[in-house]
Interface confidence: medium
C-alpha cells in the first residue's frame, strides 16, 4: 500500500510542467517503493538496484516506456507522440 506524501507542480515554463512527487509505501520483504502504471507501488527491489526502471511498468497502459541511457529515469511516450520524462532522485 502506498500514499502520496507531497506533490509539487511547477508550470512556469511554457509547454512544460515539472512535478515532484514523494510517496510513502509499506512494502513486503524484497520490495521497495516504486511506480507502476504512473502510480506509487511496491516493486521488486532488484529493479531499483539495477535501475531497470521500465521493468516496474511505470507508464500508463498504451504508453511506451524508454529507459534514459544514463539510467537516471525513464520516459513514457503517449500514442500521439507526447513524451513524459521521469527522473529518480
Amino acid at each position: 500500500t502506498c500514499e502520496i506524501v507531497t506533490l509539487d507542480r511547477d508550470s512556469s515554463q511554457p509547454r512544460r510542467t515539472i512535478a515532484r512527487q514523494t510517496a510513502r509505501c509499506a512494502c513486503r520483504k524484497g520490495q521497495i517503493a516504486g511506480t507502476t502504471r504512473a502510480r506509487p507501488a511496491c516493486v521488486d527491489a532488484r529493479i531499483i538496484k539495477t535501475k531497470q526502471w521500465c521493468d516496474m511498468l511505470p507508464c500508463l497502459e498504451g504508453e511506451g516506456c524508454d529507459l534514459l541511457i544514463n539510467r537516471s529515469g525513464w520516459t513514457c511516450t503517449q500514442p500521439g507522440g507526447r513524451i513524459k520524462t521521469t527522473t529518480v532522485s
Epitope: Q52, C65, D66, L67, I69, T75
Partner: antibody, heavy 122, light 110 residues
C-alpha cells in the same frame, strides 16, 4: 528473423566525416534501443554509442565522444552513426547492435549486424 | 576493464568454462559473444547473465558468482572453436554508463 544491415563504409580521409546506416527488419524497431560497436583490425570489441527507443537520448564511448552523433528513424527502421574529424584509429569494422528488453548495454545485445568496414587513410 | 583468460583448450565432448570478472555494473549482468573469425560478425550466445537466444544450442549456459561470470560449454564441439568476448557496463562521471568488453578468449577444440 532479426536482420541488421549496415552500409556506408569504405575508404575515408583523415579529418573527414562518415555516415553509416543500419537498416533493421524482423522486429518492432521502435520498441528497442540500438547501438554501435566497432572492432579495429586484430583487436577486440569497442563500444561506440547507443540511442534510446524514441531517439531522444544518446550516449557515446570516450574515444568518439564529441565527434559522434547517433540518430534513428523509427518510420524507416534505420539507425545512423555520423562520425566527424576522422582519425586513423577510427579504422575498423562497425557493427550495428540491438538491445534486448527495454535497454541496450554491453550485456544485453541479442542481435548483431554483419558489419561495415571503414578505412581512414590519406 | 573486464578480465578473461586469453585462451582455453578442450577435447570434443569435454566441458569448458570461460570466466570474466570486473566491470562496473554487475547488476546489469554480463553477455557473451562468439566470433569465429576476425572478419565475421559477433554472435550472441548468452545475454543478460543467463538468457540464451533461441537459435543457440543448450550446451551454452551462463552463471554468476559474486563479480565473476562464467560461460560454460557442456560437451564442446569442433564448431565452437572461436573467440569469446564478455560484455558488461562501466560507469564514469565523464561518459556515464558505457559498454565494455573483455579482450577475448580463444577457444581451441583439440
Amino acid at each position: 528473423a532479426v536482420t541488421l544491415d549496415e552500409s556506408g563504409g569504405g575508404l575515408q580521409t583523415p579529418g573527414g566525416a562518415l555516415s553509416l546506416v543500419c537498416k533493421a527488419s524482423g522486429f518492432t524497431f521502435s520498441s528497442y534501443q540500438m547501438g554501435w560497436v566497432r572492432q579495429a583490425p586484430g583487436k577486440g570489441l569497442e563500444w561506440v554509442g547507443v540511442i534510446n527507443k524514441s531517439g531522444s537520448d544518446t550516449s557515446y564511448g570516450s574515444a568518439v565522444k564529441g565527434r559522434a552523433t547517433i540518430s534513428r528513424d523509427n518510420g524507416q527502421s534505420t539507425v545512423r552513426l555520423q562520425l566527424n574529424n576522422l582519425r586513423a584509429e577510427d579504422t575498423g569494422t562497425y557493427f550495428c547492435a540491438k538491445g534486448s528488453a527495454s535497454y541496450i548495454t554491453a550485456a544485453t545485445i541479442d542481435a548483431w549486424g554483419h558489419g561495415t568496414e571503414v578505412i581512414v587513410s590519406s | 576493464a573486464l578480465t578473461q583468460p586469453s585462451s582455453v583448450s578442450a577435447n570434443p565432448g569435454e566441458t569448458v568454462k570461460i570466466t570474466c570478472s570486473g566491470g562496473g555494473s554487475s547488476g546489469y549482468g554480463y553477455g557473451w559473444y562468439q566470433q569465429k573469425s576476425p572478419s565475421s560478425a559477433p554472435l550472441t550466445v548468452i545475454y543478460w547473465n543467463d538468457k540464451r537466444p533461441s537459435d543457440i544450442p543448450s550446451r551454452f549456459s551462463g552463471s554468476k558468482s559474486g563479480s565473476t561470470h562464467t560461460l560454460t560449454i557442456t560437451g564442446v564441439q569442433a564448431e565452437d572453436e572461436a573467440v569469446y568476448f564478455c560484455g558488461n557496463d562501466d560507469y564514469s562521471s565523464d561518459s556515464g554508463y558505457v559498454g565494455v568488453f573483455g579482450a577475448g578468449t580463444t577457444l581451441t577444440v583439440l
